[in-house]
Interface confidence: low
């Protein structure tokens, strides 16, 4: 006859490991006992358990409560055992020795491999601001046995770099994602993907990119200078910018205080019926936590009477 076992038994941390050992004998042969031992290189054999055909299972004190026979029905030629709640320290070489009658003794070895699934963590880098060069957006670390694979899934353009640290029974892998921040990256997901044989599916951690920026400010409302004449109602200047976090707006006049009756409403400066005192240089100040911007415009309120007077002069001169 001969022993049937596996070269390698792979189990995930915390699961039960079935250590197979089956004697395939000729008819009439019987198994008297099966002895299980751990036989790591350079160390003496450590007994796990003894299965006796007459007296049943005896577990050594070091493995008390952790070694059991598989549930019935059991074949009398099956010497397999269950090692409950596998831990990393259980990883190693195991041997089953089978005493049979009348064929004698047989032995076989297997290797138990305990997979330690990673628990990945994602750490965002420093605050991202438009105008920075290549900047760390996030780093992702996962430790497991064997070493996990760490990659990135994103639409954002960037570069990755990985490094690995080996420990006695595991390995930690850290991958960094660097990018050049731009406002279009706002709200884009950056996902760390961790693969490992101990995981049923990839683990994914998503970080949402936030890039602080403040666009250049500009002022709208002076497109047609001829509309800015004495007596005109409803004249307004609007400050245009955008930013994240959203900016606040402030209006001042460079050449003195804002004239009375001029209304500041956020990004808009509203004028009462225009007079020449509304002529001047107006400045829109835009700011957020990231930056501030200014834009200035010159308002020149026209006097229609002056203009018509000039036209009359021109006509009479011709």
């Amino acid at each position: 006859g001969e022993l049937e076992t596996s070269d390698v038994v792979t189990v995930v941390l915390g699961q039960d490991a079935k250590l197979p050992c089956f004697y395939r004998g000729d008819s009439g042969e019987q198994v008297g006992q099966v002895a299980w031992a751990r036989v790591d290189a350079g160390e003496g054999a450590q007994e796990l358990a003894l299965l006796h055909s007459k007296y049943g299972l005896h577990v050594s004190p070091a493995y008390e409560g952790r070694v059991e026979q598989p549930p019935p029905p059991r074949n009398p030629l099956d010497g397999s055992v269950l090692l409950r709640n596998a831990v990393q320290a259980d990883e190693g070489e195991y041997e089953c020795r089978v005493s049979t009658f009348p064929a004698g003794s047989f032995q076989a070895r297997l290797r138990l491999r305990v997979l330690v699934p990673p628990l990945p963590s994602l750490n965002p880098g420093p605050a991202l601001e438009e105008g920075q060069g290549l900047t760390l957006a996030a780093s992702c670390t996962a430790e497991g046995s064997p070493a996990p694979s760490v990659t990135w899934d994103t639409e954002v353009k960037g570069t990755t770099s990985s490094r690995s640290f080996k420990h006695s029974r595991s390995a930690a892998v850290t991958s960094e994602f660097h990018l050049v921040p731009s406002r279009s990256m706002n709200g884009q997901p950056l996902t760390c993907v961790v693969s490992h044989p101990g995981l049923l599916q990839d683990q994914r951690i998503t970080h949402i990119l936030h890039v602080s920026f403040l666009a250049e400010a500009s002022v709208r409302g002076l497109e047609d200078q001829n509309l800015w004449h004495i007596g005109r109602e409803g004249a307004m200047l609007k400050c245009l910018s955008e930013g994240q976090p959203p900016p606040s707006y402030n209006w001042t006049r460079l050449d003195g205080p804002l004239p009375s009756g001029v209304r500041v409403d956020g990004d808009t400066l509203g004028f009462p019926p225009l007079t020449t005192e509304h002529s001047g240089i107006y400045v829109c100040h835009v700011s957020n936590e990231f930056s501030s911007r200014d834009s200035q415009v010159t308002v020149d309120v026209l006097d229609p009477q002056e203009d018509s007077g000039k036209q009359v002069d021109l006509v009479s001169a011709s």
Partner: antibody, heavy 117, light 106 residues
């Protein structure tokens, strides 16, 4: 667990100033914004404004001329003042917390303010 | 300001149904969008942030998708506790909310 609680008078006369306080417990205001959002009866939500941990504020442009948001860090409180109120300001007023970006992960239970003479 | 157009304004559905609510922004909001659920007399609760990310404790039957100006909230296998009003909200610039979608029992 972070909790936010609004308090203040439930009735305000037209043209007066509405004043509410939001008390934050179970967490500090550091690195967060405290926002005010309102909801007129049977209607949708309207963002009023925010005060950031650094003390800076942003307001909804449509309300900016009437709104002031301030804070008392020692008491972990944020206050809202809305001046020159009219019946259109009748609403449930909520305070809410956000990170640096304007989505709100914790909300107060809301307080109904009625503007009526 | 950016306008958020939410549809439908209301819908009737049965337990077990799949419900889809859409939100359209008047300009690109770069996935800066959140979804909230509000029950009668209660404050809104964050469901999804940054268009696709489920907030802590939100059941996996909720999912968010979309980019640019078009966004969707999907509820698979509607449960009795899911009835209420849902709002989208952008946080690209001055925040504004959609008009809401009332999900009622058929």
């Amino acid at each position: 667990q972070v909790q936010l609680q609004e308090s203040g008078p439930g009735l305000v006369k037209p043209s007066e100033t509405l004043s509410l306080t939001c008390t934050v417990s179970g967490g500090s205001l550091t690195n967060y914004g405290v926002h005010w959002v309102r909801q007129p009866p049977g209607k949708g939500l309207e963002w009023i404004g925010v005060i950031w941990s650094g003390g800076s504020t942003n307001y909804n442009p449509s309300l900016k001329s009437r709104v002031t948001i301030s804070r008392d860090t020692s008491k972990n409180q944020v206050s809202l003042k809305l001046s020159s109120v009219t019946a259109a300001d009748t609403a449930v007023y909520y305070c809410a917390r956000s990170g640096k970006w304007y989505y709100f992960d914790y909300w107060g239970q809301g307080t109904l303010v009625t503007v009526s003479s | 300001d950016i306008q958020m157009t939410q549809s439908p304004a209301s819908l009737s559905a049965s337990v077990g149904d799949t419900v889809t609510i859409t939100c359209r922004a008047s300009q690109n909001i770069y996935s800066n969008l959140a979804w909230y659920q509000q029950k009668q007399g209660k404050s809104p609760q964050l469901l999804v942030y940054a268009a696709t990310n489920l907030a802590d404790g939100v059941p996996s039957r909720f999912s968010g998708s979309g980019s640019g100006t078009q966004y969707t909230l999907k509820i698979n296998s509607l449960q009795s506790e899911d009835f209420g009003t849902y709002y989208c909200q952008h946080f690209w610039g001055t925040p504004t909310f959609g008009g809401g979608t009332k999900v009622e029992i058929k």
